[in-house]
């Protein structure tokens, strides 16, 4: 199926031009999405093009500026947050990025009633995290790893924790590994629905080994960055969950929530917290060997002022074929009875589906079923459940939004998005207002992205929020590559692939092939989304065919494919890329002497192993910030898929699956190895070890490092990186500059 819908036809073919590398580096063809900042059932905030904060009322059709760009500019604010009582706004400035999600900032509180900034008892700086209570205008914030509470913005703060210490004890914010691999947030505190209680995590990193690397900066001496970072098999952070009554915080102080006995008996993780009511909270825990997860529902005991988690309210989720969950263990969405919930987990056929759990997991009612997967539950109301899946027309790389009417029997299912803009839109997400009165649909492709507003009762489209008209006009004279998504059936495995073809593609000709690979567990590269990026340029201007293949270990096609790589990373992912390449050669339009592979992060690991596979298929390849040994990567991620690097567990495969072990096999390929020296995630150590092994084996290779750059290689490094990789590929494919 051809994915990119035909655009406005231009009769003057000579006015059409190919994409340039400059187009990509300048972000000329980037798109916009519109996610309403919902503040009620029918109102949302949005930052206008001129930086005013505007409140829109869908029902009255009125809008007004609640915060002017002048006020924003007065403190150089780049972000804002309205208090639920609409009396105050926090303004965020001096943004300073830390890790993937975390950053510090300076916060100012603006009083909307008098049009002035709150003076007296100002917030300290820099703050690590700040948020309003869900009701009223209480503030919780984290400063120097401790949590503080303000009843009102102008009040003096109440200090909740006192033991916070840099790189040792983290309160209300995650340490490195929890941020990156478990919570995927910058915060680790959660208000109860009406703001009565505040729950928070305390992470003790005292005994965790530290990764230290040089940050060269501009000074005479480099400084050393130290991060408590547990690598596979190392000592992990110790986590505790506390809850404090924010009305009378000094009364009994923070109360610890007990850990389920079956979890506490060995190393464990806390995976998420979901408030159900002000006096009921749901915690999810995970054994260090991540195939057992326990969901624990805890109730506040007024008489003792403690939290009780009865064993009858513990629900166990266990995988016998792999790890628990997909990338993460799914989180529950509670129904109106405040005890039963909806949750996505594997059904008996090994597909992730929505289940309804009341008393026990064994008695769960399966809500969705089929040889496809439910991906996200967006919202549950009294009569509807909204979720996304890849069911429609059996394309795993699509996302449509569905509504199940749960208020009647039998529950009927309706696809809300399947036929809205079928050619243009096959990959959606959604954002719902309170009680799902209204919702925004954000379509990511395969055509030009579009965001629309809908009535939550009738699903009628109310208005277009963003349709990227400028982008559409800019693309009218661009020769974009053609894209197709198809599948290969190989040995009872379905390999979905996306092929990006030059604009004047002719099947009777031969083209160089570039494989772009990620291939990490529970990832998906073959998606029906719009993108004008580096590989689009390589196809459009340089005449390459680019292919992306989802092999074993990838997501949303059932557990058989997903868990195939369990305890065996680096084997089947590579095999499946190679198998696909052989199939592409059979198609007749690939020049088998000009095949390359490249990937970043996990993709750098797979591309390295593919180059070192000894098949002779690849002429050259690039690895950007690759993992080279699973012993060097984070415990939480690595052990989920590989178990422990111990003799009685999986040490043998840890050793067998390194890139270094295959150094000799790089002799007959051109290899470009790239890494940032300040990569906090996949440490420079990984590439240093590859380089050392290649040198020791006397194998020639090319390398590039990016000083003081992290895993993202952002800013000017991005331009340098893509320019450098382009030269490398053109040289490999004997394409003239």
């Amino acid at each position: 199926i051809v994915l990119r819908p035909p655009r406005v036809h231009n009769s003057e073919e000579n006015t059409m031009r190919a994409l340039t590398l400059k187009d990509i580096l300048n972000g000329t063809f980037s798109y916009k999405t519109f996610f309403p900042n919902w503040i009620s059932g029918q109102e949302y905030l949005h930052q206008s093009a001129d930086n005013n904060i505007v409140l829109y009322n869908i029902e009255t059709g009125q809008s007004y500026t609640i915060l002017s760009n002048r006020t924003m500019k007065s403190v150089n604010a780049s972000n804002y947050g309205l208090s639920p009582d609409r009396q105050f706004v926090y303004l965020e400035s001096d943004y300073s990025k830390l890790w993937r999600y975390s950053y510090t900032a300076t916060y100012y509180i603006y009083d909307l009633s008098n049009g002035e900034f709150v003076r007296g008892n100002e917030l300290p700086r820099p703050i690590q995290y700040l948020c309003w209570s869900p009701v009223g205008s209480k503030l919780a914030y984290v400063y120097q790893n401790n949590i503080y509470l303000k009843q009102r913005p102008g009040d003096p703060p109440f200090q909740i924790t006192f033991n916070g210490r840099e790189n040792k004890i983290f309160n209300g914010i995650p340490d490195w590994v929890y941020e990156e691999e478990m919570l995927a947030t910058k915060y680790a505190l959660w208000w109860s629905p009406n703001g009565k209680f505040l729950a928070y995590a305390e992470f003790n990193d005292t005994d965790i080994p530290v990764i230290a690397y040089s940050y060269y900066g501009d000074e005479q001496y480099p400084r050393t960055i130290n991060i408590p970072y547990p690598k596979a098999g190392a000592k992990n952070p110790f986590v505790r969950i506390f809850i404090i009554d924010t009305t009378y915080p000094a009364y009994v102080g923070p109360q610890e929530v007990p850990v389920p006995a079956m979890i506490a008996s060995s190393d464990y993780y806390f995976s998420w917290l979901t408030w159900v009511t002000d006096e009921r909270v749901c915690l999810q825990w995970l054994k260090r060997v991540q195939n057992v997860s326990v969901l624990s529902i805890c109730d506040f005991r007024e008489d003792w002022q403690t939290w009780d988690c009865p064993k009858t309210q513990e629900h166990i989720e266990e995988s016998r074929t792999g790890w628990a969950g997909g990338f993460f263990v799914s989180t529950p969405v509670f129904s109106y009875d405040a005890i039963s919930y909806y949750k996505i987990f594997s059904d008996k056929d090994g597909y992730k589906h929505i289940h309804y759990i009341k008393d026990t997991v064994e008695n769960a009612i399966q809500i969705t079923s089929g040889k496809w997967e439910a991906i996200n539950i967006f919202r549950v109301t009294q009569d509807s459940l909204f979720y996304s899946s890849n069911e429609f027309e059996d394309y795993p790389g699509r996302r449509n939004i569905y509504r199940i009417s749960i208020g009647s029997y039998p529950p009927s299912k309706k696809c809300v998005t399947c036929h809205l803009r079928k050619e243009r839109c096959q990959y959606y997400t959604a954002s719902f207002s309170d009680y799902a009165k209204y919702y925004a649909l954000v379509c990511y492709g395969p055509g030009i992205p579009i965001s629309t507003l809908h009535d939550g009762r009738t699903d009628q489209e109310i208005k277009i929020l963003e349709e990227n008209k400028e982008l559409e006009n800019a693309l009218k004279n661009i020769q974009l590559p053609k894209e197709e998504i198809k599948k290969l059936e190989v040995d009872e495995i379905t390999l979905w692939y996306k092929m990006i073809l030059p604009p004047q593609f002719d099947r009777s000709k031969k083209y160089p092939l570039l494989i772009q690979v990620y291939g990490g567990p529970c990832s998906q590269s073959v998606r029906s989304v719009f993108a004008v990026n580096w590989i689009s340029y390589l196809a459009s201007k340089e005449g390459m065919v680019i292919a992306l293949v989802d092999g074993r270990g990838t997501a949303f096609q059932g557990d058989k494919l997903l868990y195939a790589v369990y305890r065996k990373l680096g084997v089947y992912e590579v095999e499946d890329q190679i198998t696909a390449v052989r199939k592409f050669i059979e198609m007749g339009f690939i020049d088998e002497k000009r095949i390359a592979i490249w990937g970043w992060s996990y993709g750098g690991y797979v591309s390295s192993l593919a180059l070192a596979s000894g098949t002779g298929l690849f002429k050259c390849g690039i690895a950007v910030a690759p993992v080279s040994s699973w012993e060097y990567y984070a415990s939480v991620y690595t052990e989920r898929f590989m178990g422990l690097p111990t003799k009685d567990d999986n040490l043998e495969h840890y050793k067998n699956s390194t890139v270094m072990a295959r150094a000799e096999y790089f002799r007959n390929v051109d290899y470009l190895l790239i890494h940032g020296t300040a990569d906090d995630n996949v440490h420079f150590q990984n590439s240093a070890q590859i380089a050392k092994a290649l040198v020791n084996a006397q194998v020639d290779f090319q390398a590039m490092w990016y000083s003081d750059q992290n895993h993202g290689l952002s800013g000017l490094s991005t331009n340098h990186l893509y320019t450098h990789m382009t030269h490398f590929l053109k040289q490999c494919f004997s394409l003239s500059d």
Epitope: P310, Y356, I365, I406
Partner: antibody, heavy 122, light 107 residues
Framework: EVQLLESGGGLVQPGGSLKLSCAAS????????MSWVRQAPGKGLEWIGE????????NYTPSLKDKFIISRDNAKNTLYLQMTKVRPEDTALYYC???????????????WGQGTTVTVSS | ELVMTQSPASLSASVGETVTITCRAS??????LAWYQQKQGKSPQLLVY???TLADGVPSRFSGSGSGTQYSLKINSLQPEDFGSYYC?????????FGGGTKLEIK
């Protein structure tokens, strides 16, 4: 008008078998959860078991699990209770009851039949 | 299996009085509770579900309340037709057991 009509009761010897039926009318039987409940003479109500609309879920009270079988035929609008290995203590008035779907995913016993009497005696 | 303990087993009251029947579960049933009325020689009739929601056609003098393990059925201003037996039943987890019943008689 909703009607549930039990039949098949009578005198049965200990160790014997009996099949009770419950004919439904006046509502969409194929969308209702159905249950059997019994009441021994002068005693309270005892829940026997339930069956969901498409027969994919059938639950019993543990003590009766191995001797009673609940089934349904949606085409015939009929619910069944197969009783085996009966004992004198199974003597009771047997009711079938039908339930509305209630959010979220459970039912209540809104409609009851008039009951059929089973006497177990030698 | 959850045990439902109903009290009192019997009580006598006069027309116009208010009575309360209680039901205690051996574990939390999270409001998944129904109340039934059964008159002599008749089938039971649903009065209340979800612990406090009145079934269709049930007079407003009946009301259900409670949470966790403790629930009650209150009848305000007793009418002659209210006399009979009352049963609670939980719907939390199978088996859906009944309470032992409360016999309400005319004083």
């Amino acid at each position: 008008e909703v009607q549930l009509l039990e039949s098949g009761g009578g005198l049965v010897q200990p160790g014997g078998s009996l099949k009770l039926s419950c004919a439904a009318s006046g509502f969409d039987f194929s969308t209702y959860w159905m249950s059997w409940v019994r009441q021994a003479p002068g005693k309270g109500l005892e829940w026997i078991g339930e069956i969901n609309p498409d027969s994919s879920t059938i639950n019993y009270t543990p003590s009766l699990k191995d001797k009673f079988i609940i089934s349904r035929d949606n085409a015939k609008n009929t619910l069944y209770l197969q009783m085996t290995k009966v004992r004198p203590e199974d003597t009771a008035l047997y009711y079938c009851a039908g339930g509305y779907y209630r959010y979220p995913y459970y039912y209540t016993m809104d409609y009851w039949g008039q009951g059929t009497t089973v006497t177990v005696s030698s | 299996e959850l045990v439902m303990t109903q009290s009192p087993a019997s009580l006598s009251a006069s027309v116009g009085e208010t009575v309360t029947i209680t039901c205690r579960a051996s574990g939390s049933i999270h409001n998944y509770l129904a109340w039934y009325q059964q008159k002599q020689g008749k089938s039971p009739q649903l009065l209340v579900y979800n612990a406090k929601t009145l079934a269709d056609g049930v007079p407003s003098r009946f009301s259900g309340s409670g949470s966790g393990t403790q629930y009650s059925l209150k009848i305000n201003s007793l009418q002659p037709e209210d006399f009979g037996s009352y049963y609670c039943q939980h719907f939390w987890s199978t088996p859906y057991t009944f309470g032992g019943g409360t016999k309400l008689e005319i004083k």
